[in-house]
Interface confidence: low
């Protein structure tokens, strides 16, 4: 516990004039001047009516104001003569005296009131010396402390009852105890009076010291009956931007150049790389110009920057598709969350006067266009004989924080002529016992002027193929067997060569006994 404080309500040691307490009967206690152990002059009371039996001598102090105190302590200094050392005394000689108190709301006592007896006076204790003395000049001073309470009225009197002792009351001090204001767990607790009983625990509410915050509530400390603090409950801790100092009684602001991101008892730390503070009490260090923190970065992480451009972009064009490959940037910006984006631009016009615009949505990127972790991408569905610019951007977790666009490396390419794409679905317009009339849509991507179409067909049961060429996107196949199934495929041709065949489709000729041609039969997929 912490040191207890004692506050005096009354102390005879400092009284130099008469005490003028009330004694009853007047032949009992007598006020005399004397000296304390340090030979300072003091006022004392003595009684020594030992040769007379049936003594009942009372002494009452002046009125003592209570000051909201619930329990009062009385320190008595006295000497007692050893009954055996006094000649010619009856057996009623005592070596003890009694301590009483009486509560009142004002100074109402008189020579006859309250009545000189236990009840109305409240007995505190019978006081016995540790040592009595046999010779008048060799008196040993006894010191005794007693307490009483709870008190409720405005003040009280102390009273001393002698029943036949030879003694001197050297000093009387009435005081109370309180717990001194203290700092514990970064919280301040005020000076607090002790409770009504020696075992009482008085709750003192706490407040966090400056620059501290509560970490557990409620904040309280208990003041015990001896004026000592015990059982702390709750605690504060230094707020962000502050560190413990002066044996945990202060929270000191972090000096410039340091910070503390979390509340607690940890110290301020130097700013992480690429950051600084310009004022004290920083909970985070601000990033240097062109350095940033991502939203997911903690306050104690270094500030980082955007990556430099990718290096060594290589293109490998194959007709209307290409593969781009590149190397890692020289500078990753201090981060490990590097990604790549590939921006496609289609260019029109010649040389330096060309204008470029974003590519069409049908351009395909494998594995993807944005957020690549790989340093390779396959790009297809480009237009033939067209100039393109591809920008390979390097980005990381702070690219979105930078006001500047991502850094990139660009490569210019021109596509070659490509063969036409696949012919879509074939349709049957009519069939007879010996012929099939078919049509089809041109390829989605002709990649040039279509010169003609080649059709491959065979009877399903035989598998020997025949071919026929058509300048139009329809054809009539003649000389077929009746009631037979035929598998048909078509492909388109440009100057770049043939495209891929369409998917195989099945059609049937009609029976010879049928009544003419059957119209618009749907294709039968394999």
């Amino acid at each position: 516990g912490c040191r207890a404080l004692e506050e005096t309500l009354m102390d005879t040691k400092w009284v130099t004039s008469e005490l003028a307490w009330t004694s009853h009967p007047e032949s009992g206690w007598e006020e005399v001047s004397g000296y304390d152990e340090a030979m300072n002059p003091i006022r004392t009371y003595q009684v020594c009516n030992v040769r007379e039996s049936s003594q009942n001598n009372w002494l009452r102090t002046g009125f003592i104001w209570r000051r909201d105190v619930q329990r009062v302590y009385v320190e008595l200094k006295f000497t007692v003569r050893d009954c055996n050392s006094i000649p010619n005394i009856p057996g009623s000689c005592k070596e003890t005296f009694n301590l009483f108190y009486y509560e009142a709301d004002s100074d109402v006592a008189s020579a006859s009131s309250p009545f000189w007896m236990e009840n109305p006076y409240v007995k505190v204790d019978t006081i016995a010396p540790d040592e009595s003395f046999s010779r008048l000049d060799a008196g040993r001073v006894n010191t005794k402390v007693r307490s009483f309470g709870p008190l409720s009225k405005a003040g009280f009197y102390l009273a001393f009852q002698d029943q036949g002792a030879c003694m001197s009351l050297i000093s009387v001090r009435a005081f109370y105890k309180k717990c001194a204001s203290t700092t514990a767990g970064f919280a301040l607790f005020p000076e607090t009076l002790t409770g009504a009983e020696p075992t009482s625990l008085v709750i003192a509410p706490g407040t966090c010291i400056p620059n501290a915050v509560e970490v557990s509530v409620p904040l309280k400390l208990y003041c015990n009956g001896d004026g000592e603090w015990m059982v702390p409950v709750g605690a504060c801790t230094c707020a962000t931007g502050h560190e413990p100092a002066a044996k945990e009684s202060q929270c000191r602001p972090c000096p410039p150049g340091s910070y503390k991101a979390k509340q607690g008892e940890g110290p301020c730390l130097p700013c992480p790389p690429n950051s600084r503070t310009t004022s004290p009490a920083a909970s985070i260090c601000t990033c240097h110009n062109n350095f940033y923190r991502a939203d997911s970065d903690s306050a104690d992480s270094a500030c980082t920057t955007v990556p430099s451009p990718p290096r060594g972009v290589i293109s490998n064009v194959n007709e209307t598709s290409l593969i781009l490959e590149w190397s890692e940037p020289r500078d990753l910006g201090g981060r490990d969350d590097l990604l790549y984006n590939v921006i496609c631009k289609k260019c029109h016009g010649a040389g330096g006067a060309s204008a470029c615009s974003r590519c069409d949505d049908n351009v395909e990127f494998v594995p993807r266009q944005l957020g690549l972790t790989e340093r390779r991408v396959h790009i297809s569905h480009l237009l033939a004989h067209t100039r393109y610019t591809f920008e390979v951007q390097a980005v990381n977790g702070v690219s979105g924080k930078s006001p500047l666009p991502p850094r990139y490396a660009a490569v210019n390419i021109t596509t070659n002529q490509a063969a036409p794409s696949e012919v879509p679905t074939l349709r049957l317009h009519s069939s007879s016992g010996s012929s099939l009339t078919l049509s089809w849509a041109p390829p989605e991507r002709p990649n040039g002027v279509i010169l003609d179409y080649e059709m491959k067909y065979f009877e399903k049961s035989e598998g020997i193929a025949s071919t026929v060429t058509s300048q139009m996107n329809s054809v009539q196949l003649d000389g077929l067997r009746p009631d037979a199934r035929y598998v048909v495929q078509v492909r388109a041709r440009t100057v770049a060569g043939y495209g891929q065949y369409s998917r195989p489709a099945e059609f049937e000729t009609t029976s010879e006994r049928g009544s003419g041609a059957q119209q618009l039969q749907e294709q039968l997929p394999l």
Epitope: E214, K262, Q263
Partner: antibody, heavy 121, light 112 residues
């Protein structure tokens, strides 16, 4: 006084989407993260994820990654959660809850009254 | 995912009794920063959950001191020293140390 006021009950068909709101008052909306919690009828609580209204940074429970989308409107101090491709399993009460911090995290300290979602054909 | 197992599922008590609820995690829930983000919530019938305890043993503002939390690593306990009528409901433990954050299955505190 801190308050989180959630939007009213929703009735939706399987496959549809719903978007519920959580309006914050009594504190600085952008200073505290907002969490979402699911409670099926008569069941326990399930954490869906959270959003930082200041930066729109989100973190989802993987289980709800394709189900829930969090957004926040700083001007109206309102957090939103959209649930998509609803199934009967999504019928539940959904709570928004503020993540308390006083220098450091101390729990989900204030909760909305909940929005009931019923999926029925 | 970390699984929090609460026991018992149901806890019948008399008013004034002490109640104790256990919460066990499938692995340690000490965060890399050294804190243990284990909380306790109470959900009364027809109401939203309310925070009681955070970081294992810290009582949230306004929570009576008859509620106390303890434990470390994987074993945690909520104690109510003298149960009052207003304490009845379902108690959930919750960990916020590792994503996804998870709740325990709940313990229903009811009158015997």
């Amino acid at each position: 006084e801190v308050q989180l006021q959630q939007s009213g009950a929703e009735l939706a068909r399987p496959g549809a989407s719903v978007k519920m709101s959580c309006k914050a008052s009594g504190y600085t909306f952008t200073s505290y993260w907002m969490h979402w919690v699911k409670q099926r009828p008569g069941q326990g609580l399930e954490w869906i994820g959270y959003i930082n209204p200041s930066s729109a940074y989100t973190e989802y429970n993987q289980k709800f990654k394709d189900k829930a989308t969090f957004t926040a409107d700083k001007s109206s101090s309102t957090a939103y959660m959209q649930l998509s491709s609803l199934t009967y399993e999504d019928s539940a009460v959904y709570y928004c809850a503020r993540e308390g911090k006083y220098g450091s995290y101390y729990g989900l300290d204030y909760w909305g009254q909940g929005t009931s979602v019923t999926v029925s054909s | 995912d970390i699984v929090l197992t609460q026991s018992p599922l149901s806890l019948p008590v008399s008013l004034g009794d002490q109640a104790s609820i256990s919460c066990r995690s499938s692995q340690s829930i000490v965060h890399s920063n050294g804190n243990t983000y284990l909380e306790w919530y109470l959900q009364k019938p027809g109401q939203s959950p309310k925070l009681l305890i955070y970081k294992v043993s810290n009582r949230f503002s306004g929570v009576p001191d008859r509620f106390s939390g303890s434990g470390s690593g994987t074993d945690f306990t909520l104690k109510i020293s003298r149960v009052e009528a207003e304490d009845l409901g379902v108690y959930y433990c919750f960990q916020g140390s590792h994503v996804p954050w998870t709740f325990g299955g709940g313990t229903k505190l009811e009158i015997k």
